[in-house]
C-alpha cells in the first residue's frame, strides 16, 4: 500500500507499560518492536492513540492478565476498547470478559479485541481494564494498535 | 486494493498440521481453505511465513489447545508469535498465556494473537507453543496468517 | 485507502442481537457504533454478511459467553466462522473452543476469531455457536465484521 503522499499508510502498535497510576486506563510506550508509521497517528500521554485523518480503521488490543477467583471481586476481568471523539462523550467500542481463574496464586489468561470503526480527525482510542495491577507486562503479552484501511 | 503490478496484494492464511517433530514450533500447510496470494509470501519448511517485500504487515495466529492443570507443569500454556529477520536474532512479537483448565481429561481453550509490524525483505514469522501435543488440529481451530498493508 | 470509485473501501462491523430463534446462527444488527461502508457489503436477514465483489477479505468475530460446567453438556462452547458461497456447500473457516467455567452461576469468557480469506461475489459469512442462550449481548461484547484488502 505505498499509497503516495496523498494517502500514506497509517498504522501503530504500542507496548504495555506498568504504571503507578491508579487509573483503569492502560499505559503504553513506543518501545521494543513498536510501530508508529508517521505523525498521522500519535501516542498521547502514554494512554491513547490519536488519529489526524478521518476514515475507517481496524483497531485492536491484546491484554494478558493474572488473577485468582478467591482474591478478586466476583465481577470478571473486563478489558474495554474505548473511543473519545472531539466534542463527544466517551463510548465503548469493544469489550471482553474473562472470569477469574481458580489457579493459585493466579491464573493467566489472554484477551484479544479487534474491529473496524470510523474515526473522526482528532479521535482517540484507549484501553480500560477492571484491575490494571493484574495485567502482565512481559514481552509481547499486552499491546494495542490500529491500521487505517 | 487491486494495487497493480507495482503494488500487488500480499496475504497468507495457513492451516495447522499435526507433526511428529518434537520442536515447539508449530507446523502449517497450504490445505483446506488456505490463502497464498502470490510468491511475495511463502510458507517455508511448513513452519514459517517469509515475505519478499519490506513493509507493514498485520500478522495473526490462532491456537486452540486442550490441557489439564493436574497433568501439566505449573507454567501456563504460552503461544508466541516470533520474528526472524536476516542477520538478526529471533525476537518475540506477541505472546498469549492461558493457565491450564481443571476440566478432565483436558479443557479446550483458544488463543488469538495479532498486531502490525514492520518486516524486512526475507523476514520470517513463526509460532511457538509450550506443548505442541496439546494443540487442536481440527478444522478451523488453529491457523496463522498475515496481510501487507 | 481512498481507493477511488473503481476500488472503494469495503468494510463492515455489526453488533450482536439477542434472538428468540432457536438456531445456532448468531443474529446481528446495524446499531450502536456499527460500520457499513457501502452497498458492496450487506447484512442479510440479520445473520450474514454478504459481499458483492471477489477478493481477499480479513474476516473477524468476537463472542463473549457465560456458561457453567455443571449446567452445560460436556462438549465445550464452540464459535465457528462459516462461509456460504453461491452454488457451494457451507464450510467452516475458523473455530474456537472454550471449556465451560466452574464459576457459579456462570463464568464469562471471550473468544476472538480472525483470518484472511478469498470470497467470491455473492459469498456470505456467518457465525455459529453451540449455545446462543449463553452469549453476552452487552455493549461491545459480541461483534462481527470484515474488511476488503
Amino acid at each position: 500500500m505505498q499509497k503516495g503522499d496523498q494517502n500514506p499508510q497509517i498504522a501503530a502498535h504500542v507496548i504495555s507499560e506498568a504504571s503507578s497510576k491508579t487509573t483503569s486506563v492502560l499505559q503504553w510506550a513506543e518501545k521494543g518492536y513498536y510501530t508508529m508509521s508517521n505523525n498521522l497517528v500519535t501516542l498521547e500521554n502514554g494512554k491513547q492513540l490519536t488519529v489526524k485523518r478521518q476514515g475507517l480503521y481496524y483497531i485492536y488490543a491484546q491484554v494478558t492478565f493474572c488473577s485468582n477467583r478467591e482474591a478478586s471481586s466476583q465481577a470478571p476481568f473486563i478489558a474495554s476498547l474505548c473511543l473519545k471523539s472531539p466534542g463527544r462523550f466517551e463510548r465503548i467500542l469493544l469489550r471482553a470478559a474473562n472470569t477469574h481463574s481458580s489457579a493459585k496464586p493466579c491464573g493467566q489468561q489472554s484477551i484479544h479485541l479487534g474491529g473496524v470503526f470510523e474515526l473522526q480527525p482528532g479521535a482517540s482510542v484507549f484501553v480500560n481494564v477492571t484491575d490494571p495491577s493484574q495485567v502482565s507486562h512481559g514481552t509481547g503479552f499486552t499491546s494495542f494498535g490500529l491500521l487505517k484501511l | 486494493m487491486q494495487k497493480g503490478d507495482q503494488n500487488p496484494q500480499i496475504a497468507a492464511h495457513v492451516i495447522s498440521e499435526a507433526s511428529s517433530k518434537t520442536t515447539s514450533v508449530l507446523q502449517w500447510a497450504e490445505k483446506g481453505y488456505y490463502t497464498m496470494s502470490n510468491n511475495l509470501v511463502t510458507l517455508e519448511n511448513g513452519k514459517q511465513l517469509t515475505v519478499k517485500r519490506q513493509g507493514l504487515y498485520y500478522i495473526y495466529a490462532q491456537v486452540t489447545f486442550c490441557s489439564n492443570r493436574e497433568a501439566s507443569s505449573q507454567a501456563p500454556f504460552i503461544a508466541s508469535l516470533c520474528l526472524k529477520s536476516p542477520g538478526r536474532f529471533e525476537r518475540i512479537l506477541l505472546r498469549a498465556a492461558n493457565t491450564h483448565s481443571s476440566a478432565k481429561p483436558c479443557g479446550q481453550q483458544s488463543i488469538h494473537l495479532g498486531g502490525v509490524f514492520e518486516l524486512q525483505p526475507g523476514a520470517s514469522v513463526f509460532v511457538n507453543v509450550t506443548d505442541p501435543s496439546q494443540v487442536s488440529h481440527g478444522t478451523g481451530f488453529t491457523s496463522f496468517g498475515l496481510l501487507k498493508l | 485507502m481512498q481507493k477511488g470509485d473503481q476500488n472503494p473501501q469495503i468494510a463492515a462491523h455489526v453488533i450482536s442481537e439477542a434472538s428468540s430463534k432457536t438456531t445456532s446462527v448468531l443474529q446481528w444488527a446495524e446499531k450502536g457504533y456499527y460500520t457499513m461502508s457501502n452497498n458492496l457489503v450487506t447484512l442479510e436477514n440479520g445473520k450474514q454478511l454478504t459481499v458483492k465483489r471477489q477478493g481477499l477479505y480479513y474476516i473477524y468475530a468476537q463472542v463473549t459467553f457465560c456458561s457453567n460446567r455443571e449446567a452445560s453438556s460436556q462438549a465445550p462452547f464452540i464459535a465457528s466462522l462459516c462461509l456460504k458461497s453461491p452454488g457451494r456447500f457451507e464450510r467452516i473457516l475458523l473455530r474456537a473452543a472454550n471449556t465451560h467455567s466452574s464459576a457459579k452461576p456462570c463464568g464469562q469468557q471471550s473468544i476472538h476469531l480472525g483470518g484472511v480469506f478469498e470470497l467470491q461475489p455473492g459469498a456470505s459469512v456467518f457465525v455459529n455457536v453451540t449455545d446462543p442462550s449463553q452469549v453476552s449481548h452487552g455493549t461491545g461484547f459480541t461483534s462481527f465484521g470484515l474488511l476488503k484488502l
Partner: nanobody
Framework: EVQLVESGGGLVQPGGSLRLSCAAS????????MGWFRQAPGKEREFVAA??????????VYADSVKGRFTISADNSKNTAYLQMNSLKPEDTAVYYC?????????WGQGTLVTVSS
C-alpha cells in the same frame, strides 16, 4: 484414519478385578493423553482416568470416584493404554470407552461392557 480398539470387558463379582486395554492404530504423530470414560445405563458419559504424554509425560489424573481402586498406565511405544480396575462395585457397571487426544483431536473407541454383579 486413527482408530481406538478396547478389550478386556466382561462380567465380574463385586470386589473383583478386571484389566481393560486400548490400542491406537493408524498414523499417529502426537499424543497428549490416552484415557477412559464410562457410561452407565440412563446416565451421562463420565471421565474415569487419563495418562498424559507430550510435555506432561508420566502424569495421571483420576475421577474422585475411582481414586485408589483404578490404575491407568500407558505403553507409549505401542500407543496402548491399560486400566487396572480393582475392588469393583456394582456402581462401576457401565460401558467403558477409550478416549485419546491424538494428532490434535479427540478420538473415541466403540466401548467395552463391564458388568459388576453377584
Amino acid at each position: 484414519e486413527v482408530q481406538l480398539v478396547e478389550s478386556g470387558g466382561g462380567l465380574v463379582q463385586p470386589g473383583g478385578s478386571l484389566r481393560l486395554s486400548c490400542a491406537a492404530s493408524g498414523r499417529i504423530f502426537s499424543t497428549y493423553f490416552m484415557g477412559w470414560f464410562r457410561q452407565a445405563p440412563g446416565k451421562e458419559r463420565e471421565f474415569v482416568a487419563a495418562s498424559y504424554t507430550g510435555g506432561s509425560g508420566g502424569s495421571t489424573v483420576y475421577a474422585d470416584s475411582v481414586k485408589g481402586r483404578f490404575t491407568i498406565s500407558a505403553d507409549n511405544s505401542k500407543n496402548t493404554a491399560y486400566l487396572q480396575m480393582n475392588s469393583l462395585k456394582p456402581e462401576d457397571t457401565a460401558v467403558y470407552y477409550c478416549a485419546a487426544w491424538l494428532n490434535g483431536g479427540n478420538r473415541w473407541g466403540q466401548g467395552t461392557l463391564v458388568t459388576v454383579s453377584s
